[in-house]
């Protein structure tokens, strides 16, 4: 809290300009009118105020707008945004994508702070859904943004927005998130031809069910091992040796290096050793010849 002191003669600010740069805290408090500041917020960013000075300017705006800043002020906050708390931001009503972009630009280089997370939350809630333009903007600034959302939040992403997603945007997504995103991606890319479709759908395949993997195995897609290793274990287990061979194409040789890791390890345990031997990779651990495989889960379902 800055003490209330009278503004020295001749120091009253008539506009927000560089003459304020060496004003002390108390001089800024006493000599800068909050309404003037609000109307000339766009000038603040052109003046390298210290953090101490920015604190005073924020205090003046807080006094002028106790219920939250109007968007005309928010759009021009510039570096003052870094001084805002999540509590401040929860009072805002941000509807313009330009405002969002302006504030994210200020935060560039920083991790996604609680302030930014609150801002995005307010913006998305105000829009009702995560539309393509918003998603485009958010993933450009924060590639991991999509994977920071809960499956429930992801369910509000329209399939059309999936076109904005790049492979790196999904790097940190877990299987639950990909379970939600995969059907949307499948819908979004459904009109593409085989090879183009696979390029687009590839990074979402961690959410694909067995039947879709079987279908892909018929299309000569040559899935790489990195993608295969991210598939759901429960989706891989029912695949036959022949289907995995078709799915991976020339990359099938990579299975040997991954035979101790999931889902390859678990898949090997479900295959007949005879079938595994046909790959000629020396994969071990399959079901020995002459053993009967009972699918208990199928039996339970029937009963």
């Amino acid at each position: 809290e800055v003490e209330k002191t009278a503004c020295p003669s001749g120091k009253k600010a008539r506009e927000i300009d560089e003459s304020l740069i060496f004003y002390k805290k108390w001089e800024l408090e006493a000599c800068v009118d909050a309404a003037l500041l609000a109307t000339q917020m766009d000038r603040v960013n052109a003046i390298p105020f210290t953090y101490e000075q920015l604190d005073v300017l924020k205090h003046k705006l807080d006094e002028l707008y106790p219920q939250g800043y109007p968007e005309s002020v928010i759009q021009h906050l510039g570096y003052l945004f870094l001084k805002m708390s999540p509590e401040d931001i929860r009072k805002w009503n941000v509807t313009s994508l330009e405002t969002l972009k302006a504030l994210l630009e200020v935060n560039k280089g920083h991790e996604m702070s609680p302030q930014v997370a609150t801002l995005i939350d307010r913006f998305v809630k105000g829009r009702g859904q995560l539309d393509k333009d918003t998603l485009d903007t958010l993933t450009a600034f924060y590639p991991g943004y999509l994977c920071s959302l809960s499956p429930e939040e992801l369910s509000s992403v329209p399939p059309s927005s999936i076109w904005a997603v790049r492979p790196q945007d999904l790097d940190t997504c877990d299987p639950r998130q990909l379970d939600v995103l995969y059907p949307k991606a499948r819908l979004a890319f459904q009109n593409m031809n085989g090879s183009e479709y696979f390029v687009k759908i590839q990074s979402f395949l961690g959410g694909a069910p067995t039947e879709d993997l079987k279908a892909l195995s018929q299309q000569n897609v040559s899935m790489d091992l990195a993608t295969f290793m991210k598939l759901r274990t429960d989706a891989v287990l029912p695949l036959t040796v022949a289907e995995v061979q078709k799915l991976l194409g020339p990359h099938v040789e990579g299975l040997k290096a991954e035979e101790r890791h999931r889902p390859v390890r678990d898949w090997i345990l479900r295959q007949r050793q005879d079938d595994l031997d046909t790959l000629g990779l020396g994969l071990q651990g399959g079901i020995p010849n002459g053993y009967l495989v009972l699918d208990l889960s199928m039996q339970e379902a029937l009963s």
Epitope: E18, I21, P48, T50, Y51, D55, H110
Partner: antibody
Framework: QVQLVESGGGLVKPGGSLRLSCAAS????????MSWIRQAPGKGLEWVSY????????YYADSVKGRFTISRDNAKNSLYLQMNSLRAEDTAVYYC???????????WGRGTLVTVSS | IQLTQSPSSLSASVGDRVTITCRAS??????LAWYQQKPGKAPKLLIY???SLESGVPSRFSGSGSGTDFTLTISSLQPEDFATYYC?????????FGGGTKVEIK
């Protein structure tokens, strides 16, 4: 290419004068506040002087106040430091550096050496 | 505001984790920058706002702290990292620098 290049340094006797220049290129010079920062041999960095983007607001460290004058010519993308009444303790490498929206120095020149000695 | 860096110099080997501290004489929020200076070269901005990495700076550099105590960490020292490091506060004018920490080869 974004850069700052200082010139004008040299050997001068105590009480003498020198004018340093800093040529900016590759960015909108007139948007930036500019500074002179010096580094005495084997010592740390000292902020010497500061000028606003238009040139109307100026700061000097107490150690140079009344002896040094900072100025700029935005049309020529140039910054200057007129140094008068030089003392042995002014011996240093002088760097020009730029500031945009927050007062840290995002771009520095390579420096020019000023030696004050009889 | 005075900034005190410690240590003033240190010896380390390639691959080492190196930590440099900067202490402010009063609270400065997160208004701290770190610079690297190699002999005969201009200082180069590494980190601003205490922890934000300047564009193009390798991710092995990181900054932390707020208030009065700040740290610059180099997670795995590389040959090109042997240099002198300075902190600078921008919480209030006049802007001030720390005395520097020289990182030398062991």
């Amino acid at each position: 290419q974004v850069q700052l290049v200082e010139s004008g340094g040299g050997l001068v006797k105590p009480g003498g004068s020198l004018r340093l220049s800093c040529a900016a290129s590759g960015f909108t010079f007139s948007d930036y506040y500019m500074s002179w920062i010096r580094q005495a041999p084997g010592k740390g960095l000292e902020w010497v002087s500061y000028i606003s983007s238009s040139g109307s607001t100026i700061y000097y460290a107490d150690s140079v106040k009344g002896r040094f004058t900072i100025s700029r010519d935005n049309a020529k993308n140039s910054l200057y430091l007129q140094m008068n009444s030089l003392r042995a303790e002014d011996t240093a490498v002088y760097y020009c550096a730029s500031i945009l929206s927050v007062p840290y120095f995002d771009l520095w020149g390579r420096g020019t050496l000023v030696t004050v000695s009889s | 505001i005075q900034l005190t860096q410690s240590p003033s110099s240190l010896s380390a080997s390639v691959g080492d984790r190196v930590t440099i501290t900067c202490r402010a004489s009063q609270g400065i929020s997160s208004a701290l920058a770190w610079y690297q200076q190699k002999p005969g070269k201009a200082p180069k901005l590494l980190i601003y706002d205490a922890s934000s990495l300047e564009s193009g700076v390798p991710s092995r550099f990181s900054g932390s702290g707020s208030g009065t105590d700040f740290t610059l960490t180099i997670s795995s020292l590389q040959p090109e990292d042997f240099a002198t490091y300075y902190c600078q506060q921008f919480n209030s004018y006049p802007l001030t620098f720390g005395g520097g920490t020289k990182v030398e080869i062991k």
